[in-house]
């Protein structure tokens, strides 16, 4: 007789991040006897929603539904029907929606229920949208790449299991960046925590862990270049901004109004002679770093060290993982590999900036001209921020890793907010029962 | 002070379908959500399903997922219930509730007098 | 879906007398609760929401406290007109969801 496989005890759950730029649909899965064992979850599929971030929904909201349907019926595909009413749903949103609550909460609110409203008609088990703070994208982030790479196991290895692993239980910190905000996190090296805004204090698997953790608003790389735009066409004599973050020959029409619509702007907003402008691309990495410096403000500091803009950054210590479009940018650019200097890096952004726009549409004839014009501003962004930013210098620069995924699960806040919601982080190191570990080798 | 006006008491056989109206006069219709609440005899309160009116938007309980039809004419401030394939378990009276919270806040702080639907053969 | 349990399912008491009426939530909601009054051949009538605080028109007699899972209505001294069946219902999460009553009858 042919021998039955045993149904698959096993849970699932979804995370929807809804960032700025877009939302993105994520399913995990794991054993269900194995919910407290340290590694055990792991990402079954992403689905990237075809559109802008929801907050571009406020005066379209009648268009949610439609927009979340494609990876809500993937979602319904991929788990098993007899899974679907245990399957927790939650959705995070992050920057994008936190500016949109600057301006109006009810604007905010308006599209998180239309959200809501949407994603409750599906027969999975909705937990609720909310909007996440700064501070906990941070620490989810450090928590996610921490359990992925194993850092929570009180198991010692002689082996590696994954890339990256410094084979001792120090953690790494974490850096995220988005669209409209960047989040630093790791464990300082005996440092006392000096603004409260940013310590956090976690007991995970037995062990306590005390995080310094910052978010900064308006310095993801798409609200950085606004906010570059808005600071350079204050002193342009004309409607013509020379912009040394474009190759040369490209050029764009920005209006006035689009870029006097965040309220990361709003420092730099005056009254201009023209409703409209055009960004003319010169292609000089230098100047163009420049001109990023200018929006870190390190005059002032009320601590013993700043990263920028008077926030406290205790002195960097270990191992960094930098994720999302730190490394969907550096991964495009060719530079995530570890052989690859800061001195390196900044030898080849230079040759990529001074590229011409008709040279590059060629070369990247299958990317999106969007995206693709702003990969010299983004790349540049990211070592102004990392090395002005945050005090990274060409030594340290080793030990950033550009990481996209650790294995099979994507770098990022959804896997450590999940896990914290399911409960599936004890504080204490379970008992390991023989039951429970039967099927380890 | 908005008021909710509801449409009169209906008998319905096994298998057909019930439309209630729920039309609303002294106040905002559009921007809040218009639920709607079921109550057999001698028994319990039950969520069915909500619209705002705004946006045309409606969500169900599973339940009810694919026999209730929640709609909205907001140039007649009206909002209706559809229910197909009714069977004798439907019976009930049938409230529609304003959530008078705005948005994300669904606490119903208006009702209608109920509409009595008996189903039988 | 959170399930609402309400207890007791009846309480007997007196005219002037104190009522408390207990209400408990599946999964935290936060203060995102809401109490009820129904009579006989009437629809509901909204008392308490975010977990304590009066809808308009409504008596001081009538409090809501709690948050998270445990919630309490107590009418501090019970009027005739008071005798009804009390729901509580949650409105955190889709869907909406009530408990299944607390009938308040004279003693």
């Known amino acids: 007789t042919q021998n039955k496989a045993l149904p698959e005890n096993v849970k699932y759950g979804i995370v929807l991040d809804a960032g700025s730029s877009h939302t993105s649909l994520y399913i995990y899965k794991w054993p269900a006897e194995k919910e407290n064992d340290t590694g055990v979850v792991h990402q079954v599929e992403e689905c990237r929603v075809k559109g802008p971030g929801i907050s571009k929904f406020v005066q379209k909201v009648n268009e949610i539904g439609i927009y979340l349907t494609d990876c809500m019926e993937r979602a319904r595909e991929v788990i098993p029907r007899s899974q679907h009413q245990e399957t927790p749903v939650y959705l995070g949103a992050t920057a994008g929606m936190r500016l949109l609550r600057m301006e109006s909460e009810e604007l905010a609110d308006r599209v998180l229920d239309v959200v809501e409203r949407s994603l409750s008609n599906y027969p999975f088990d909705f937990q609720g949208a909310r909007i996440i703070t700064g501070q906990e994208e941070g620490a989810y982030g450090w928590i996610t790449i921490n359990y992925l790479l194993g850092k929570f196991s009180q198991k010692t290895r002689w082996f590696s299991i994954v890339p990256y692993e410094t084979n001792n239980q120090e953690t790494f910190g974490a850096l995220d960046l988005g669209g409209a905000s960047t989040q630093v996190t790791f464990v300082p090296q005996n440092q006392t925590i000096e603004s409260p805004d940013n310590a956090l204090q976690f007991r995970l698997y037995g062990k306590d862990y005390n995080v310094y953790t910052h978010s900064f608003l308006c310095y993801g790389k798409d609200q950085a270049l606004w906010q570059k735009l808005a600071k350079d066409i204050q002193v342009a004599s004309n409607e013509i901004l020379r912009d040394p973050c474009f190759h040369p020959g490209y050029k764009k029409v920005v209006n006035v109004s689009d870029l006097y619509k965040t309220p990361c702007t709003k420092r730099f907003e005056m009254t201009l002679p023209f409703q409209q402008f055009e960004i003319q691309g010169i292609g000089n990495y230098q100047q163009c770093h420049q001109s990023i410096l200018e929006l870190f403000n390190t005059s002032y500091c009320p601590y013993s060290q700043c990263a920028f803009n008077g926030i406290f950054l205790p002195p960097l210590q270990g191992d960094f993982g930098a994720f999302s479009a730190f490394y969907f940018v550096m991964k495009f650019l060719n530079l995530t590999s570890e052989k690859v200097s800061q001195e390196k890096v900044t030898e080849m952004m230079k040759k990529f900036c001074a590229q011409p726009w008709e040279e590059i549409k060629t070369s990247y004839a299958g990317v999106k001209e969007k995206y693709l014009s702003e990969y010299c501003f983004s790349g540049t962004y990211i070592l102004s921020l990392l090395l002005q930013g945050y005090h990274f210098t060409a030594d340290s620069w080793e030990h950033i890793h550009f990481i996209g995924k650790i294995q099979g699960s994507d770098a990022g806040w959804t896997l450590g907010y999940m896990l914290n919601l399911t409960n599936m982080i004890p504080a204490e190191q379970p008992l390991s029962t023989p039951l429970s570990h039967s099927t380890y080798v | 002070q908005v008021q909710l006006v509801q449409s009169g008491a209906e008998v319905k056989k096994p298998g057909s379908s019930v439309k209630v109206s729920c039309k609303a006069s002294?106040?905002?219709?559009?921007?809040?959500?218009i639920s709607w609440v079921r109550q057999a005899p001698g028994q319990g309160l039950e969520w069915m399903g909500s619209?705002?009116?705004?946006?045309?938007?409606?969500n169900y309980a599973q339940k009810f997922q694919g026999r209730v039809t929640i709609t909205a004419d907001e140039s007649t401030s009206t909002a209706y219930m559809e229910l197909s394939s009714l069977r004798s378990e439907d019976t009930a009276v049938y409230y529609c509730?304003?959530?008078?919270?705005?948005?994300?806040?669904?606490?119903?702080?208006?009702w209608g007098q109920g509409t009595m639907v008996t189903v039988s053969s | 879906e959170i399930v609402m349990t309400q207890s007791p399912a009846t309480l007997s008491v007196s005219p002037g007398e104190r009522a408390t009426l207990s209400c408990r939530a599946s999964?935290?909601?936060?203060?995102?609760l809401a109490w009820y009054q129904q009579k006989p051949g009437q629809a509901p009538r909204l008392l308490i929401y975010?977990?304590?605080t009066r809808a308009s028109g409504i008596p001081a007699r009538f409090s809501g406290s709690g948050s998270g899972t445990e919630f309490t209505l107590t009418i501090s001294s019970l009027q005739s007109e008071d005798f009804a069946v009390y729901y509580c219902?949650?409105?955190?999460?889709?869907?909406?969801?009530f408990g299944g009553g607390t009938k308040v009858e004279i003693k």
């Open positions: 509730a304003r959530e008078s919270g705005g948005y994300r806040d669904h606490r119903l702080g208006v």
């Open positions: 002294g106040g905002t219709f559009s921007k809040y959500g």
């Open positions: 619209i705002i009116p705004e946006f045309g938007i409606a």
């Open positions: 999964q935290s909601v936060g203060s995102n």
């Open positions: 975010g977990a304590s």
């Open positions: 219902q949650q409105y955190l999460l889709w869907p909406l969801t």
